[in-house]
Interface confidence: low
C-alpha cells in the first residue's frame, strides 16, 4: 500500500539573520 507523501512548498522571504547570522537576503524554509 502506497503512503501519501506530504509536499512541502518553500516559503521565501527577505530576511536578516534568518538563514545565516550575518546575512540579509532571501531565505527559504519548507
Amino acid at each position: 500500500r502506497r503512503r501519501r507523501r506530504d509536499t512541502h512548498f518553500p516559503i521565501c522571504i527577505f530576511c536578516c539573520g534568518c538563514c545565516h547570522r550575518s546575512k540579509c537576503g532571501m531565505c527559504c524554509k519548507t
Partner: antibody, heavy 122, light 107 residues
Framework: QVQLVQSGDEVKKPGASVKVSCKAS????????ISWVRQAPGQGLEWMGW????????DYARNLQARVTMTTDTSTSTAYMELRSLRSDDTAVYYC???????????????WGQGTTVTVSS | EIVLTQSPGTLSLSPGERATLSCRAS???????LAWYQQKPGQAPRLLIY???SRATGIPDRFSGSGSGTDFTLIISRLEPEDFVVYYC????????FGGGTKVEIK
C-alpha cells in the same frame, strides 16, 4: 572603498574598562555582522564575539561573555566592543572584522580594521 | 567547541618551493565554513580562502585550498618572498575558532 577604521590605542589600569570603536564605510553597514578578534603579543588570533548590525544579536566567546559587551550605532555605521575588569593578560591588539556570507558559504572575515592596541598595566 | 590544530608550527622552505599547510579539526566541519588567512608582521590578517577552496578577491592563484570533514590543506604552489609570514585557518560552526597558526620561514 570598503573599510573599517578603529579608534586609537589605549593604556588602561587593571580593573578598568576599555571601549573600542570600529567605523564602517563603503558598504551597507546593516547588511553584515561584525566579529571582534584579539591577538596578544607574539600569540595567535582569538575570536571574541560577534554582533549582527541589523538586529543587535550577539554571540560571545564563552571565556569572555561575563566581561564583554558588543553594540552598534547604525546611525553612524559604528560597532563598539567594551571589555570590563581588565587584566594584564588582556593586553593585545583588538581587531574588528566584517563577517561575509554568500548563499550557503561563510565567506570569512573579509574586511578588517587596522587594529587597536590595548595595554593593561599598573 | 571545535579545536583546530595547524601543522607544522613552522615550515622552512626556499623561494620557489611548494608549501603545504595542514589544518585538522577536532570534529567535522562543513567545507562551506572553513577559511584561511595570511598575516604579515604588524598588519591585520588578510582573507585568502573561504569555503575551503574559493580564493578571496585579489588573491593570486598560487594559493589554493582543499579538504573536507576534519582535514583541510592550504597550498602555496611557488613561494614568493612576501609569502614568508604566518597563516591561520578558521572555522565557523556553532562559533568561530582559529587554528594556532603556521609560520612559513625562509630556509
Amino acid at each position: 572603498q570598503v573599510q573599517l577604521v578603529q579608534s586609537g590605542d589605549e593604556v588602561k589600569k587593571p580593573g578598568a574598562s576599555v571601549k573600542v570603536s570600529c567605523k564602517a564605510s563603503g558598504y551597507t553597514f546593516i547588511k553584515y555582522g561584525i566579529s571582534w578578534v584579539r591577538q596578544a603579543p607574539g600569540q595567535g588570533l582569538e575570536w571574541m564575539g560577534w554582533i549582527g548590525a541589523f538586529n543587535g544579536n550577539t554571540d560571545y566567546a564563552r571565556n569572555l561573555q561575563a566581561r564583554v559587551t558588543m553594540t552598534t550605532d547604525t546611525s553612524t555605521s559604528t560597532a563598539y566592543m567594551e571589555l570590563r575588569s581588565l587584566r594584564s593578560d588582556d593586553t593585545a591588539v583588538y581587531y574588528c572584522a566584517r563577517e561575509g556570507w554568500n548563499d550557503d558559504y561563510f565567506c570569512g572575515l573579509d574586511v578588517w580594521g587596522q587594529g587597536t592596541t590595548v595595554t593593561v598595566s599598573s | 567547541e571545535i579545536v583546530l590544530t595547524q601543522s607544522p608550527g613552522t615550515l622552512s622552505l626556499s623561494p620557489g618551493e611548494r608549501a603545504t599547510l595542514s589544518c585538522r579539526a577536532s570534529q567535522s566541519v562543513s567545507s562551506n565554513y572553513l577559511a584561511w588567512y595570511q598575516q604579515k608582521p604588524g598588519q591585520a590578517p588578510r582573507l585568502l580562502i573561504y569555503g575551503a577552496s574559493s580564493r578571496a578577491t585579489g588573491i593570486p592563484d598560487r594559493f589554493s585550498g582543499s579538504g573536507s570533514g576534519t582535514d583541510f590543506t592550504l597550498i602555496i604552489s611557488r613561494l614568493e618572498p612576501e609569502d614568508f609570514v604566518v597563516y591561520y585557518c578558521q572555522q565557523y560552526g556553532s562559533s568561530l575558532t582559529f587554528g594556532g597558526g603556521t609560520k612559513v620561514e625562509i630556509k
